[in-house]
């Protein structure tokens, strides 16, 4: 009954921002689904979750320490986060559930993707004392 | 904490109209189903109507189609069952329930009792 | 509509027994099989769902197992608290059907 994801199991972020994409084996359309992302080995911190149908357009909510928003089409959930910096670095899970009508489905947990935020080094050019 | 709060019921003749309410807190409202379960004085269970989270979807047990209806209202966090042309056998305890994998939040019930 | 029998309808059994209330589908429902306890003028409390998964909150005395069509309810060591009547509940397909309930009273 379980549904399967499939994530990019690498992700290596140079700028702030990156667009974190979700494929499932389920049409999005087919029930009232709540699509989410959660972050740490243990899924500790809901990073962002949005609810969808076909009617309507989710609003994707973030946890306060991340900027999010999503989108969808029938088979593919896309997170977009910002503002992210190098403690962003972590692996994060792609989440289904449908909610409504039952019965009520969830995902397997995919192997999710590891988001490698790079560290900005700023380069100093240094001046040679002057004797 | 999760909280459920039903109002709305009382006494109303056969034929008459009610308007409950459940005012719900403690969790994201929009993102669950929510319903209405009946219990009659001394009976068992029975659902009664539920709507998706986005409040598109309804759907409602065979003895109330027609005369039931209902609704949510997720700026306010309140879900409502508007009952028309009652009927003695609508008399029960009315709770509204969440709806996630199973009903795992009740609130404490609302009388309606149908009575000339 | 998916039908819901549970039985007994009554029991009567004493503090520290072991009590199994059964309930049966009238087709598969796969695992989407829930508990719940009532006690007198109060709401029903879920104690099982998804057949065999212990809700938060709830002692490990209960537990629930079944698939298809027959699923179980067992109380391992029955606690003052635990008289009450108890209801499954189907959410495979919709509409939500409830069984009739099982009343466990004092021997």
């Known amino acids: 009954n379980k549904i399967l994801v499939k994530q990019s199991p690498l992700l290596v972020v140079d700028s702030n921002e990156v667009s974190l994409s979700c494929r499932y084996s389920y049409n999005l359309l087919a029930k009232e689904f709540r699509a989410s992302l959660y972050k740490g080995v243990n899924s500790d911190v809901e990073v962002c979750v949005g609810n969808g149908n076909f009617t309507y357009q989710p609003q994707f909510r973030s946890n306060a320490e991340f900027n999010c928003d999503g989108d969808f089409d029938n088979e593919t959930v896309t997170f977009r986060l910002w503002n992210l910096h190098v403690n962003h670095t972590d692996i994060y899970f792609c989440k289904i559930e449908f909610m409504y009508p039952p019965p009520y489905l969830d995902n397997e947990r995919s192997n999710g993707t590891i988001i490698h935020i790079k560290e900005k080094h700023l380069c100093h050019t240094q001046s040679s004392p002057k004797l | 904490e999760v909280q459920l709060l039903e109002s709305g019921g009382g006494l109303v003749q056969p034929g008459g109209s009610l308007r409950l309410s459940c005012a719900a807190s403690?969790?994201?409202?929009?993102?669950?189903?929510m319903s209405w379960v009946r219990q009659a004085p001394g009976k068992g269970l029975e659902w009664v109507s539920a709507?998706?989270?986005?409040?598109?979807?309804?759907y409602y047990a065979d003895s109330v189609k027609g005369r039931f209806t209902i609704s949510r209202d997720n700026s306010k966090n309140t879900l409502y069952l508007q009952m028309n042309s009652l009927r003695a056998e609508d008399t029960a305890v009315y709770y509204c329930?969440?709806?996630?994998?199973?009903?795992?939040?009740w609130g404490q019930g609302t009388l309606v009792t149908v009575s000339s | 509509d998916i039908q819901m029998t549970q039985s007994p309808s009554s029991l009567s059994a004493s503090v520290g027994d072991r009590v199994t209330i059964t309930c049966r589908a009238s087709?598969?429902?796969?695992?989407?099989l829930n508990w719940y306890q009532q006690k007198p003028g109060k709401a029903p409390k879920l104690l099982i769902y998804?057949?065999?998964s212990l809700q938060s909150g709830v002692p490990s005395r209960f537990s629930g197992s079944g698939s298809g069509t027959d699923f179980t309810l067992t109380i391992s060591s029955l606690q003052p608290e635990d008289f009450a009547t108890y209801y499954c509940?189907?959410?495979?397909?919709?509409?939500?059907?409830f069984g009739q309930g099982t009343k466990v009273e004092i021997k």
């Open positions: 509940q189907q959410g495979g397909m919709p509409p939500d059907t």
């Open positions: 087709q598969s429902i796969s695992s989407y």
């Open positions: 329930a969440k709806r996630y994998i199973a009903f795992d939040y």
């Open positions: 709507i998706s989270g986005s409040g598109g979807s309804t």
């Open positions: 403690g969790f994201t409202f929009s993102s669950y189903a």
């Open positions: 998804a057949a065999s």
